[in-house]
Amino acid sequence: AILGRSETQECLFFNANWEKDRTNQTGVEPCYGDKDKRRHCFATWKNISGSIEIVKQGCWLDDINCYDRTDCVEKKDSPEVYFCCCEGNMCNEKFSYFPEMEVTQPTSNPVTPKPP
């Protein structure tokens, strides 16, 4: 392992659509992939009238957008579905929205998902 980099071996798993997809609803997911590539965790969620609805959480394949991110933070301004990724075991347990805006100072909206 490279010094200073947290390797991702497992992530929090959640699937709101678990019955249709025939998966578990929640748990811990071991991360697989090519041995030479990095692995990450992700979270996706929706903001329905101020209420946070988690869509999915799990492992994410090698992605430079996720490199060296210890926190799972969505930076895109008002996406339809929020997405963040991070490095480090279970780093997707908490996720937040911190839009990158050019003029106004961004405000953080940390989200700690309630267990289902």
Epitope: G33, W60, D62
Partner: antibody, heavy 115, light 111 residues
Framework: QVQLVQSGAEVKKPGSSVKVSCKAS????????INWVRQAPGQGLEWMGT????????SYAQKFQGRVTITADTSTSTAYMELSSLRSEDTAVYYC????????WGQGTLVTVSS | QSALTQPRSVSGSPGQSVTISCTGT?????????VNWYQQHPGKAPKLMIY???KRHSGVPDRFSGSKSGNTASLTISGLQAEDEADYYC???????????FGGGTKLTVL
């Protein structure tokens, strides 16, 4: 092993649309992007766009903006690329590829646009 | 994002080394380690050989290596073999906030 299997060759009339599919197996479909690339006869590779398979978020090359739509069906682990207002210059082999590094590719789908 | 620049063709004899260059700008190739190299044989789909400038994709022989200096990335193939004859493309990572772009391709002939 990772496999991307694309739909068969298509012959289309100018002005019509084509929808190419790309079925993924051997990995968790919702754990990466699917990119679409095309290659005209005797020419180089041209990036068209990408989709985040879990969030559905897309980005398109400026050249194809407004004419291409990339979608993903997570229930069947299949990505789709639809190109509209076809012209003869769109005759090409269309490829899907997994992830931001394009580490695994589909076999390609030849789309011929001819009147 | 403008296309990356590659030489049209390069050639070498079996056993020799060849280097293919891929020139971009200080805002893409120069500042980010996100250049990849693909090999394409006639009538086949491209294959990833090198990603992230210098990392070999699984199963790729160590005769293939990648490097970068300034705004130019390079693919070096040492100990050339007949089966290395193909088209080679450089390209960038695509996904999230990154948009993809490819070089024009380089035809490698093994003499």
């Amino acid at each position: 092993q990772v496999q991307l299997v694309q739909s068969g060759a298509e012959v289309k009339k100018p002005g019509s649309s084509v929808k190419v599919s790309c079925k993924a197996s051997g990995y968790k479909f919702t754990s990466s992007y699917i990119n679409w690339v095309r290659q005209a006869p005797g020419q180089g590779l041209e990036w068209m766009g990408t989709i985040n398979a879990v969030s559905g978020s897309t980005s398109y090359a400026q050249k194809f903006q407004g004419r291409v739509t990339i979608t993903a069906d997570t229930s069947t682990s299949t990505a789709y690329m639809e190109l509209s207002s076809l012209r003869s210059e769109d005759t090409a082999v269309y490829y899907c590829a997994r992830g931001g590094w394009f580490d695994y590719w589909g076999q390609g789908t030849l789309v011929t646009v001819s009147s | 994002q403008s296309a990356l620049t590659q030489p049209r063709s390069v050639s070498g004899s079996p056993g020799q080394s060849v280097t293919i260059s891929c020139t971009g700008t200080s805002s893409d190739v120069g500042s980010k380690n996100y250049v990849n190299w693909y090999q394409q044989h006639p009538g086949k789909a491209p294959k990833l050989m090198i990603y992230g400038v210098s990392k070999r994709h699984s199963g790729v022989p160590d005769r293939f290596s990648g490097s970068k200096s300034g705004n130019t990335a390079s693919l070096t193939i040492s100990g050339l073999q007949a089966e290395d004859e193909a088209d080679y493309y450089c390209g960038t990572f695509a996904g999230g906030k990154y948009y993809g772009v490819f070089g024009g391709g380089t035809k490698l002939t093994v003499l």
